[in-house]
């Protein structure tokens, strides 16, 4: 259950990290590893973490995984999991992070930080 006045700082930190990764990408991110694409909606940080956790030995996204863990420390219960957990398409990590950045910016602008 969200607190009445959530902090935007952690979301802002995530956005800054995603900007840093996606803008400074010189070579294929995480050796071109593929992750499950998601409809990044209600539990998007949890869904994003569930997808990225499969990537090991890629230090570039270590901080991103930590930040997602901070935003979603507890796994959503089954009754709260919806379409964003449907796994049908894999995309490259770089594209996944760009999608995550885009949705995070929308949430930040809307002020619904949780």
């Amino acid at each position: 259950s969200p607190n009445p006045v959530p902090s935007s700082s952690s979301l802002k930190e995530l956005i800054e990290e995603l900007v840093n990764i996606t803008q400074n990408q010189k070579v294929p991110l995480c050796n071109g590893s593929m992750v499950w694409s998601l409809n990044l909606t209600s539990s998007m940080y949890c869904a994003a973490l569930d997808s990225l956790i499969s990537i090991s030995n890629c230090s570039v996204i270590h901080r991103t995984k930590r930040m997602l863990s901070a935003l979603c420390p507890h796994k959503p219960s089954a009754k709260h999991v919806s379409s964003e957990y449907v796994r049908d398409t894999k995309i490259e990590v770089a594209q996944f992070l760009k999608d995550l950045l885009r949705h995070s910016r929308i949430i930040f602008r809307n002020g619904s930080y949780n």
Epitope: V5, S7, S10, A70, H74, Y113
Partner: antibody
Amino acid sequence: EVQLVESGGGLVQPGGSLRLSCAASGFTFISYAMSWVRQAPGKGLEWVASISSGGNTYYPDSVKGRFTISRDNAKNSLYLQMNSLRAEDTAVYYCARLDGYYFGFAYWGQGTLVTVSS
Amino acid sequence: DIQMTQSPSSLSASVGDRVTITCKASESVDNYGKSLMHWYQQKPGKAPKLLIYRASNLESGVPSRFSGSGSGTDFTLTISSLQPEDFATYYCQQSNEDPWTFGGGTKVEIK
């Protein structure tokens, strides 16, 4: 060095209230989720409450509605407000940095003892 | 709630022994192929310390004599060669479903 220091424990009567505090240092407090875990004397560990970096809170049914976890990022502090205390709430309460469901409770404080007795 | 059953509840061993502790969950704690099971060590009067996360990943700074294995409902913590500082109580914990639950603990004592 990560440090978590709990305070606020003590003796309280059944039905009473107590507020525990945890002072965090050695890491960027705002960037981590935090939790409280308790341990009754001579017993095992029990998760009590968690709070995400964004302010979402999580509780087991045993304390829901009686305990409230909160954080003050400006003060690098975590709190646990405990109301309607019962004898079975007697325990050492640990503050822990929660690195998420994939990573567990990475760091723990030394604990503060709460005794609920008349 | 997911019940965590540890065995044995206590054991006596000597320095240099190989020690195995098991933890059984009442239902699977796997999430997308990752086991949300963690192991902690607690010494008397001290706070718990994370040893293993996600069933088999060694926490930074933890000696390599500690290892974890398992998936689904059955998990094992192994100490390959018991050292004097390893005499303590060990707990497993699942984070796959709220409420997060711990095993009852296994006390490792000196023989």
